[in-house]
Interface confidence: medium
């Protein structure tokens, strides 16, 4: 369909509430440092303009693309260069280069303080102005996560509002709110990481990589749907995510709603697990479909070998329509293996493709590819063994100890990476234990490897901004599906020149005593990374001793009448102690 005015079309499709929310998210993801009020002003102006276009699509500027309209709005901000530096240079470009330039300036690690929920203050804000409260939530999440999946953020904002509607009535607001907010926070962070990986796969590895990922995932989830159906959904889904990752949030949300409608209208041929999703309102419906439980496998699936090994026409099929044939293979293999991670399924498909590429050029292709399925076993065994070993380590050490083991492992592999990044990534890698090790055997592999893909993507995104390690660059850029095996295979870097010992790194203050437990852990883990950068060959025993002494030193000073005085006296002694242990 062609519309005279795209902005009018989107406003009518989405309705005023969602339109405003999405415009607010779009501006917040681009201008991450602007105060909320500034964004509200921009949103108000854009909304008023959209309404004039709805009334008369021929009105002045209504025929401009949304990129042009949004870009013009951003570039009209007087303090743009002052607050955002070279982002202002984008304004000298024409569309579509200007929009590309804005996208490149999104900051995955903005210097914005962590949100600390204060139940009393938040309830007061909520009761004073619900609309502003909803907007503020969108703003705070969007500016911290510039690639957050916008229509999904609208969903989380509704849940957030519901939590406050319930808890602000409660006698003990904090007891009601805090666990719910924490639970929601975990969901939101996971959603942010999932979307960041989707955007990275589209932007760094192309649309085909994203389609392959989606094909495998959807085939696992909807094994009763046939290949045609899955292919159609994959194509539509790729369009939706391409738009959101590209900052076209209005189009993305509109297309996502259309896709949810299509899936619900055709649920009989897609999955038996969608019934309750399809009875929900739009945002909940889309979220529910995305999180839908796996359908049961059809009972009458034929052995894969029939079509992909025993059939004498394999090479003809492969040569004449490579993508369709390999797509069919990935679909058939994935629907039969809900227990495999998506990355593993894609690795298997790659081996199958490489084998056919090789064998179909030979004299006797069927004899050459007859054993292709045997090649898959080592690919399956590698992550399974790795997960088994790491889960055993997690059971033995507990979450904090397991994180520390990973900090040691990864600091030795890539000591050039910044300390905050190593701490963040190793801590997140360590959470795989509590997330996945307690799961039933058949869920462990997909849980662990798919989660590790999210965390390693975070490392890749942060590292790309300031590249310091060739090893990290290699693992991040060579192959999306082999990132995890690539990082697992890294050995300690023997070429690394140890850092000088900087006493200030190990200077602590009284504030340590009042920090929440997780922040206390981060301080200790930061010291551990710095220690390893100074002494990369420190033994496990030495590190254990230092950490033990550190805990004792902190405990002692936090129990002393004058915390700060104790840290001032005991701190230097502790540093001497460390140097002695590591000498």
């Amino acid at each position: 369909d062609t519309y005279k005015s795209e902005i009018a079309h989107r406003f009518k499709d989405l309705g005023e509430q969602y339109f405003k929310g999405l415009v607010l998210i779009a501006f917040s993801q681009h201008l991450q440092q602007c105060p909320y009020e500034e964004h509200v002003k921009l949103v108000r102006e854009v909304t008023e303009f959209a309404k004039t276009c709805v009334a008369d699509e021929s009105a002045e500027n209504c025929d401009k693309s949304i990129h042009t309209l949004f870009g013009d709005k951003l570039c009209a901000i007087p303090s743009l260069r002052e607050h955002y530096g070279d982002l202002a240079d984008c304004c000298e470009k024409e569309e579509p280069e200007r929009n590309e330039c804005f996208l490149q300036h999104k900051n995955d690690n903005p210097d914005i303080p962590k949100l600390k929920p204060d139940p009393v203050a938040l309830c007061a804000d909520f009761q004073e102005d619900e609309q502003k409260f909803w907007g503020k939530y969108l703003y705070e999440i969007a500016r911290r996560h510039p690639y957050f999946y916008a229509p999904e953020l609208l969903y989380y904002a509704i849940i957030y509002k519901d939590v406050f509607s319930e808890c602000c009535q409660a006698a003990d607001k904090a007891a009601c709110l805090l666990p719910k907010i924490e639970h929601l926070r975990e969901k939101v962070l996971t959603s942010a990481a999932k979307q960041r990986l989707k955007c990275a796969s589209i932007q760094k590895f192309g649309e085909r990589a994203f389609k392959a990922w989606s094909l495998a995932r959807l085939s696992q989830r909807f094994p009763k749907a046939d290949f045609t159906e899955i292919s159609k959904i994959v194509t539509d889904l790729a369009k939706v995510h391409k738009e959101c990752c590209h900052g076209d949030l209005l189009e993305c949300a509109d297309d996502r709603a259309d896709l949810a409608k299509y899936i619900c209208e055709n649920q009989d041929t897609i999955s038996t697990k969608l019934k309750e999703c399809c009875d929900k309102p739009l945002l909940e419906k889309s979220h529910c479909i995305a999180e839908a439980k796996r359908d049961e496998l059809p009972a009458d699936l034929n052995p894969l070998e029939h079509d992909f090994v025993e059939d004498k026409e394999v090479c003809k099929n492969y040569k004449e329509a490579k993508h369709v044939f390999l797509g069919t293979f990935l679909y058939e293999y994935s629907r039969r293996h809900p227990d495999y991670s998506v990355s593993l399924l894609l690795r298997i498909a790659k081996i199958y493709e490489a084998t056919l590429e090789d064998c179909c050029a030979k004299e006797d292709p069927p004899a050459c590819y007859a054993t292709v399925f045997d090649k898959f076993q080592p690919l399956v065994d590698e992550p399974k063994n790795l997960i088994k070993q790491n889960c055993e380590l997690f059971e033995k050490l507990g979450e904090y100890g397991f994180q520390n083991a990973l900090i040691v492992r990864y600091t030795k592999k890539v000591p050039q990476v910044s300390t905050p990044t190593l701490v963040e990534v190793a801590r997140k890698l360590g959470l795989v234990g509590s997330r996945c090790c307690k799961r039933p055997e058949e869920e462990r592999l997909s849980c662990a490897e798919d989660y590790l893909s999210l965390v390693l993507n975070r490392l890749c995104v942060l590292h790309e901004k300031t590249p310091v390690s060739e090893k990290v660059t290699k693992c991040c850029t060579e192959s999306l599906v082999n990132r995890r095996p690539c990082f697992s295979a890294l050995t300690p870097d023997e070429t690394y020149k140890p850092k000088e010992f900087v006493e200030g790194t190990f200077t602590f203050h009284a504030d340590l005593c009042t920090l929440p437990e997780d922040e206390k852990q981060i301080k200790k883990q930061t010291a551990l990374v710095e220690l390893l950068k100074h002494k990369p060959h420190a033994t496990e025993e030495q590190l254990r001793t230092v950490l033990g002494n550190f805990a004792a030193f902190v405990q002692k000073c936090c129990a002393a009448p004058d915390h700060e005085a104790c840290f001032a006296v005991e701190g230097p002694k502790f540093v001497i102690e460390i140097r002695g242990i590591l000498a």
């Epitope: 290949f227 159906e229 292919s231 034929n302 029939h306 079509d307 026409e313 003809k316 369709v324 069919t328």
Partner: nanobody, 126 residues
Framework: EVQLLESGGGLVQPGGSLRLSCAAS????????VAWFRQAPGKGREFVAG????????YYADSVKGRFTISRDNSKNTLYLQMNSLRPEDTAVYYC???????????????????WGQGTLVTVSS
């Protein structure tokens, strides 16, 4: 569900021609891998020709290569088998079979096709 209905069979002299049709309903024929099989009296079902779903890749049994042509008309949702230079050994009931979901693969294994027509008899005799 896919329903298939064959037509066009009959008696023909050796060296003659026939065109079989298979009308599909419940599914678009271009989304489906489809094939013709035949069954001579007292024998098992034998693959004759096939065409891939979504991609027009054709397949033929060695015994019919160069004589038979498989095709489809997506607008009519119909599959065809043009049979030329017919021989007495081509006498059989001809069945149309479908594998939905656009598996590009047209298998020669009858068991892999969930949907079948009721068949049309072709007799080649002088």
């Amino acid at each position: 569900e896919v329903q298939l209905l064959e037509s066009g069979g009959g008696l023909v002299q050796p060296g003659g021609s026939l065109r079989l049709s298979c009308a599909a309903s419940g599914r678009y024929i271009d989304e489906t891998a489809v094939a013709w099989f035949r069954q001579a009296p007292g024998k098992g079902r034998e693959f004759v020709a096939g065409i891939g779903g979504g991609v027009d890749i054709t397949y033929y049994a060695d015994s019919v290569k160069g004589r038979f042509t498989i095709s489809r008309d997506n607008s009519k949702n119909t599959l065809y088998l043009q049979m030329n230079s017919l021989r007495p050994e081509d006498t059989a009931v001809y069945y149309c079979a479908a594998r939905p979901g656009r598996p590009l693969i047209t298998s020669k294994v009858a068991d892999l096709y969930p949907y079948w027509g009721q068949g049309t008899l072709v007799t080649v005799s002088s």
